[in-house]
Amino acid sequence: MRTEAQVPALQPPEPGLEGAMGHRTLVLPWVLLTLCVTAGTPEVWVQVRMEATELSSFTIRCGFLGSGSISLVTVSWGGPNGAGGTTLAVLHPERGIRQWAPARQARWETQSSISLILEGSGASSPCANTTFCCKFASFPEGSWEACGSLPPSSDPGLSAPPTPAPILRADLAGILGVSGVLLFGCVYLLHLLRRHKHRPAPRLQPSRTSPQAPRARAWAPSQASQAALHVPYATINTSCRPATLDTAHPHGGPSWWASLPTHAAHRPQGPAAWASTPIPARGSFVSVENGLYAQAGERPPHTGPGLTLFPDPRGPRAMEGPLGVR
């Protein structure tokens, strides 16, 4: 079952409560507005370095510049995760590491940065112009991803400077994150406030049909507003990616083109406090992906007003493997 963010339908205030309600309506937008303005925007940086000793060996370093706690890091190559990118490693701050050839060694450098060394030989070694992406899932900011690659003229042993260039992803809560939700709330409440000022309070009509007020679904943007913001991904070089087969034989080089193993996007897990709380049975995690809370098992339908979702052409399980197929 999916639990959606819901707002009660607007009901006229009771006559006796009008003063208190009016006062509350005045205070709330300003509180929210303050929060909106002060909410910081996190960033992800990516640094790609070619080792001087092994010319086809790469070191990728990624970091998260934000105040939230990181719940998962996914490193991929060939483009953003879930957009044709192939997972190289998944790092969880408490649960450990899963990685895939040609990754040689993934590790945490600090609480908010990781490094990944890639093997330099064999059919699965990266091309010099490969794009590497790092996706940080954090609470409460959501998911943020940035990509980087070696500059064309890189000398061995030199590294590309860190690139804090996050790619906008509609399945990432970080697009608006908390501040986006608050901003929407601010605008909405200011709109209510204006209407409330210009209209006398009508009499309360008791509902004859239902004891509970009808509920309006939050975050259901129109097609027009969905189309309002569409940021394309960075160009992805796929020249060194073989095709997949039903029979996955790694003879003649490991089958590294695996995309994420299955079960992470389509069953998102709650990034909150994994370290300290006992983990509930599978399927009961709470997701903060997309900025809305939803019971794990189904994705929330929309990210927010005015945002275009980037559905994965491979279907709901395309993001799978962050943890190596389930």
């Epitope: 192939t86 997972t87 969880h92 701050p93 408490e94 649960r95 450990g96 590491i97 899963r98 990685q99 895939w100 050839a101 060694q105 590790r107 997949t244 087969l245 996955a248 034989h249 790694p250 490991p254 089958s255 590294w256 083109w257 695996a258 995309s259 994420l260 193993p261 299955t262 079960h263 992470a264 069953r267 897990q269 370290a275 006992p278 983990i279 599978r282 995690f285 399980r317 799978e320 493997g321 962050p322 943890l323 190596g324 197929v325 389930r326």
Partner: antibody
């Protein structure tokens, strides 16, 4: 019921190769990684490597790299491990195990395949 | 490689007793430790994952605790069917490594 049914015992000569199979049933094969574990007699367990049945992505313990090769056939929901250049040190029980990436552990173990290498 | 040390190779206990099996990691592995039980002639099976979470169907007599480098599996009210080898596993970093095992004997 979720099961990982492995192929039967093998008696082999030094220098030969063996292909151990692991047939999955009771779940969607491509939804879970398959890892392989070695248990030598009187010894503990050793992790060999992992394969993602969705796409064939692999990762090996350096100790077994070059000797073990992991493959999958999605159509028959079967994982395979080939061991080459066998020596008496390779005599052991080999297990395929299912990795649950929601909770990060080996939730289902195969029936085990005993491999004996003897001249 | 991370070394997982189970210092007690053998432990002897009686039915109804409480027993603690320990596992020490050579470096900080956070909560990335699981416990597996292997009865004679059988494949191992999952008991505890991520240090303290019981696998489906495991009785609450089995409790896991610890984080960092020291981990404990406690079996309270030991039953005769608990006669088995118990292994810890770390998946904090590659290669994943198992402890040497503790054989629990019931007297």
């Amino acid at each position: 019921e979720v099961q990982l049914q492995q192929s039967g015992p093998e008696l082999l000569k030094p220098g030969s190769s063996v292909n151990i199979s692991c047939k999955a049933s009771g779940y969607t094969f491509t939804d879970y990684n398959i890892d392989w574990v070695k248990q030598s007699r009187g010894k503990s367990l050793e992790w060999i490597g992992a394969i993602n049945p969705n796409n064939g992505g692999t990762f090996y313990n350096q100790k077994f790299k070059g000797q073990a090769t992991l493959t999958v056939y999605k159509s028959s929901s079967t994982a395979y491990m080939e061991l080459r250049s066998l020596t008496s040190e390779d005599s052991a029980v080999y297990y395929c195990v299912r990795w649950d990436s929601d909770s990060w552990y080996f939730d289902v173990w195969g029936t085990g395949t005993a491999v004996t290498v003897s001249s | 490689d991370i070394v997982m040390t189970q210092s007690q190779k053998f432990m002897s206990t009686s039915v109804g007793e409480r027993v603690s099996i320990t596992c020490k990691a050579s470096e900080n592995v956070r909560a990335a430790v699981d416990w597996y039980q292997q009865k004679p002639g059988q494949s191992p099976k999952a008991l505890i994952y991520l240090a303290s979470n019981r696998h489906t169907g495991i009785p609450d007599r089995f409790t896991g605790s610890g984080s960092g480098t020291d981990f404990t599996l406690i079996i309270s009210n030991v039953q005769s069917e608990d006669l088995a080898d118990y292994f810890c596993l770390q998946h904090w970093n590659y290669p994943y490594t198992f402890g040497g095992g503790t054989k629990l004997e019931i007297t």
